[in-house]
Interface confidence: medium
C-alpha cells in the first residue's frame, strides 16, 4: 500500500505570451497521494469549472484559454490539495500580445486655413504600437508646426494651404504593422480681396468699370452693393481662374454712390465675406462731400429728434474728437438763435439745419453723407426765410455774428445737387413739400437772383406727405 | 475726480412712493446726459430711466413708464428718480450714471456706489 | 421684444485671449448700437471698459478692445490677469418706437 504524500507541483508555472483570439495553455503538474483536488485563479478569484471560455483537463494539471481577449492577461495560480499537509501553489503571468489595431481610424477633415486640426489615430496594441503618418505617397516629417501626439493622433498647428493632401496613419509593434484608409485634409481659405475697386471722380452721364478681385477655398461668390442696396443698373462679368474671382461692374453714372464688392464663400454652415468699396463722385458737385470724412450712424439726439426720420443713418463728421456731441451742441446752439426768427422760417430753418448737419448717410468702407437737395436750401433761403437770412449774410459780413447759425456752415445753396438731375442723389426736407402746399402767399423777396433760379419744388407725392416720421409743426 | 453720490433709498411697501437723488460733482453737471440703471439682488443690469443734458426730453424702460420720472436740476448739479406705484420686482440697487455726453443714451461712463430700494410688505 | 444677448459664462487661463460677445435675439449688432462694454465685479458699481463699439475708456488698459464681429459685438481681453475675473455687461441703444438702452444678461468671466 502506498503512503500518503503531500503535493509537490514539480513543474511550477511560467509566463505564457499569447496574442489574442489564439490558444493560451498553463501546466501545473503535481506528484501527490492521494490524486490532489488543483483549483485555478486568476488575480486571485477563482475560475469557475463550468466557465466555457476555459478547458481544465489532465485532472486539473492543465489550463486552457481557448480564445484569448486583450482582457484576460494577468497572474494565473494553480492551488493543489490532498489533505496531506498543506495546499501548495505555483503562479505564472498571461502576458496578451496584440498585433497593432488602429481603433479610432482618421476622418475627412475640412478646416479653415490658419486653425488647428487633429486628426485622430487610437490604436491598441502589446507591445504598445508607434504611429507614424503618411502624406501622399511619402513619410510625414514632423515640425514646430506638425506634431504626432501621444495618443497617435496627427495635430497640425495654423493650417496652411499646402497641408491638404490624402494622410494614413501606420501603426506598428514587433508583431506587425496597421495601416488606417487614407483621408483626405481639405483646407479652406476666407474669402479675401486680392485687388479692390478703385474710386472714380468723373462727369455726369461718363460710363465707369468697377473691378474687384476675389480669392478663397471654395472659390468666393461676388456681390455688389450700390448706396447699402443691390445694384440696381449696370452690367456684371465675371471669370474665374486658379480659385481667383474677377468680377466687373460697368455703370453709366447719373449720380454718386458708394460701390461695395462683397466676396463670399462657404464653410460648412458659416459664411465668410471680405468687403472693398469705391465711390464714384461726379465732378461737378464732389469737392464739397470728398473732404468730409466720419461714419454713419443713427441719430440719438434731441436737438433733431422730432425733423429726422427716425430709424435713418446720419452722417458724423470725424474732423471732431466726438463727432455726435459737437454735432448736438452747434445744433443746440443755432436752435437758440432760431427762438428770434419768424414763425414761418423757424420750422423750415430748422428742418434745413438739421437735415444740412446731420446729412443722411450711405453707409459702407467710405461713409458717404447726401447733401440737401439745391431747390430746398433755395426755398428755405428766399422763400421760408429771406427777410432773416439777408440780415444773417448781412451781419456775417460785418462781422457781427458770432453764433447760432454762423457757426454753423450753412449750406451754400448753389454748390447743393438738383433733384431735377437726380433725384436720388440729395436730400429732400419733407416739411417743405407739405408746408408749400398749405401757404397761399409768400412774402415777397428782394433777390439778386433771376426769379428762374427760385425753386420749382415738386408737387407732393405720398412718399412726402405728412408722415409719423417727420414733426410738422 | 467724478463722484455721483445717490440717497434716498429703502425700504417701502408696494404701492408706496420713494425719491432718489444724485448729487453730482467733479464735472460740468449741466453739460452731460445722466441715467438711472438697477440692478435686483443676484440679477444683470437694467436700464432705468435717462435724461439729456438740458432735461427737455425723458426716456423710460417699459415697465417703468407712467410710474417712475426722472427729473435734474442744473443749478444744484442733482438728478432725482421719483418713484410711485412701487412693485416688488423694483427691489433692487439703483446707480446713478452720467453719460459721455450731451445726448441721453451716450456710454455710461462714471457710476455711483448705488443705494438699495426695497419693496417688501 | 428683442433681447441683448451674451454667453452665460466662460473661462480663461492666465495670459490667454477671450472673446465675449453680445448679440441681438433677431437681428444684427451694428455700429448704431452703439456698444458699449461694462465690467463688474461682486459688490462693486460698474466700470466702463469699451463705448460706442470699439473706443477705450481713459484709464482701461489696451489689452481691452472692442469691435463687431460678423453679427455681434464682441470685447476681446488679451493677456487675461486674475483680476480681469468678472461679470462683463454690454448695453445697446436701440431704437424700435421709442429710445431704449438695453443691456445684455451678463458674463461671468473666470481666469483659472
Known amino acids: 500500500e502506498k503512503l500518503p504524500k503531500a503535493p509537490v507541483i514539480t513543474t511550477p508555472l511560467e509566463t505564457v505570451d499569447a496574442l489574442v483570439e489564439e490558444v493560451a495553455t498553463f501546466m501545473c503538474a503535481v506528484e501527490s497521494y492521494p490524486q490532489p483536488e488543483i483549483s485555478w485563479t486568476r488575480n486571485k478569484i477563482l475560475i469557475k469549472l463550468f466557465d466555457t471560455r476555459y478547458s481544465i483537463r489532465e485532472n486539473g494539471q492543465l489550463l486552457t484559454i481557448l480564445s484569448v481577449e486583450d482582457s484576460d492577461d494577468g497572474i494565473y495560480c494553480c492551488i493543489a490539495n490532498n489533505g496531506v499537509g498543506g495546499a501548495v501553489e505555483s503562479c505564472g503571468a498571461l502576458q496578451v500580445k496584440m498585433k497593432p489595431k488602429i481603433t479610432r481610424p482618421p476622418i475627412n477633415v475640412k478646416i479653415i486655413e490658419g486653425l488647428k486640426a487633429v486628426l485622430p489615430c487610437t490604436t491598441m496594441g502589446n507591445p504598445k504600437p508607434s504611429v507614424s503618418w503618411i502624406k501622399g505617397d511619402n513619410a510625414l516629417r514632423e515640425n514646430s508646426r506638425i506634431a504626432v501626439l501621444e495618443s497617435g493622433s496627427l495635430r497640425i498647428h495654423n493650417v496652411q494651404k499646402e497641408d491638404a493632401g490624402q494622410y494614413r496613419c501606420v501603426a506598428k509593434n514587433s508583431l506587425g504593422t496597421a495601416y488606417s484608409k487614407l483621408v483626405k485634409l481639405e483646407v479652406e481659405v476666407f474669402a479675401r480681396i486680392l485687388r479692390a475697386p478703385e474710386s472714380h471722380n468723373v462727369t455726369f452721364g461718363s460710363f465707369v468699370t468697377l473691378r474687384c478681385t476675389a480669392i478663397g477655398i471654395p472659390v468666393p461668390t461676388i456681390s455688389w452693393i450700390e448706396n447699402g442696396n443691390a445694384v440696381s443698373s449696370g452690367s456684371i462679368q465675371e471669370s474665374v481662374k486658379d480659385r481667383v474671382i474677377d468680377s466687373r461692374l460697368q455703370l453709366f453714372i447719373t449720380k454718386p454712390g458708394l460701390y461695395t464688392c462683397i466676396a463670399t464663400n462657404k464653410h460648412g454652415e458659416k459664411f465668410s465675406t471680405a468687403k472693398a468699396a469705391a465711390t464714384v463722385s461726379i465732378a461737378e458737385w464732389s469737392k464739397s462731400q470728398k473732404d468730409s470724412q466720419g461714419y454713419c450712424a443713427q441719430y440719438r439726439g434731441e436737438v433733431c429728434d422730432a425733423v429726422l426720420a427716425k430709424d435713418a443713418l446720419v452722417f458724423f463728421n470725424t474732423s471732431y474728437r466726438d463727432p455726435e456731441d459737437a454735432q448736438e451742441l452747434l445744433i443746440h446752439t443755432a436752435w437758440n438763435e432760431l427762438k428770434a426768427v419768424s414763425p414761418l422760417c423757424r420750422p423750415a430753418a430748422e428742418a434745413l439745419l438739421c437735415n444740412h448737419l446731420f446729412q443722411e448717410c450711405s453707409p459702407g468702407v467710405v461713409p458717404t453723407p447726401m447733401p440737401i437737395c439745391r431747390e430746398y436750401c433755395l426755398a428755405v433761403k428766399e422763400l421760408f426765410c429771406a427777410k432773416e437770412w439777408q440780415a444773417m449774410e448781412g451781419k456775417a459780413h460785418r462781422g457781427l455774428y458770432r453764433s447760432g447759425m454762423h457757426l454753423l456752415p450753412v449750406p451754400e445753396c448753389s454748390k447743393l445737387p438738383s433733384m431735377h438731375r437726380d433725384p436720388t442723389a440729395c436730400t429732400r426736407l419733407p416739411y417743405l413739400d407739405y408746408k408749400k402746399e398749405n401757404i397761399t402767399t409768400f412774402p415777397s423777396i428782394t433777390s439778386s437772383r433771376p426769379s428762374a433760379d427760385i425753386p420749382n419744388l415738386p408737387a407732393s407725392t405720398s412718399s412726402f406727405a405728412v408722415s409719423p416720421a417727420y414733426s410738422m409743426t | 475726480e467724478v463722484q455721483l453720490l445717490e440717497s434716498g433709498g429703502g425700504l417701502v411697501q408696494p404701492g408706496g412712493s420713494l425719491r432718489l437723488s444724485c448729487a453730482a460733482s467733479g464735472f460740468t453737471f449741466s453739460d452731460y446726459g445722466m441715467s438711472w440703471v438697477r440692478q435686483a439682488p443676484g440679477k444683470g443690469l437694467e436700464w432705468v430711466s435717462a435724461?439729456?443734458?438740458?432735461?427737455?426730453?425723458?426716456y423710460y424702460k417699459e415697465s417703468v413708464k407712467g410710474r417712475f420720472t426722472i427729473s435734474r436740476d442744473n443749478s444744484k448739479n442733482t438728478l432725482y428718480l421719483q418713484m410711485n406705484s412701487l412693485r416688488a420686482e423694483d427691489t433692487a440697487v439703483y446707480y446713478c450714471a452720467k453719460r459721455s455726453g450731451r445726448i441721453a443714451f451716450g456710454a455710461l461712463d462714471a457710476w455711483g456706489q448705488g443705494t438699495l430700494v426695497t419693496v417688501s410688505s | 421684444q428683442t433681447v441683448v444677448t451674451q454667453e452665460p459664462s466662460f473661462s480663461v487661463s492666465p495670459g490667454g485671449t477671450v472673446t465675449l460677445t453680445c448679440g441681438l435675439s433677431s437681428g444684427s449688432v451694428t455700429s448704431s448700437n452703439y456698444p458699449d462694454w461694462y465690467q463688474q465685479t461682486p459688490g462693486q458699481a460698474p466700470r466702463t471698459l469699451i463705448y460706442s463699439t470699439d473706443s477705450r475708456h481713459s484709464g482701461v488698459p489696451d489689452r481691452f478692445s472692442g469691435s463687431i464681429l460678423g453679427n455681434k459685438a464682441a470685447l476681446t481681453i488679451t493677456g487675461a490677469q486674475a483680476d480681469d475675473e468678472s461679470d462683463y455687461y454690454c448695453?445697446?441703444?436701440?431704437?424700435?418706437?421709442?429710445?431704449?438702452?438695453?443691456f445684455g444678461g451678463g458674463t461671468k468671466l473666470t481666469v483659472l
Open positions: 448695453g445697446l441703444y436701440m431704437y424700435s418706437g421709442s429710445k431704449n438702452y438695453v
Open positions: 435724461i439729456p443734458w438740458q432735461g427737455g426730453s425723458t
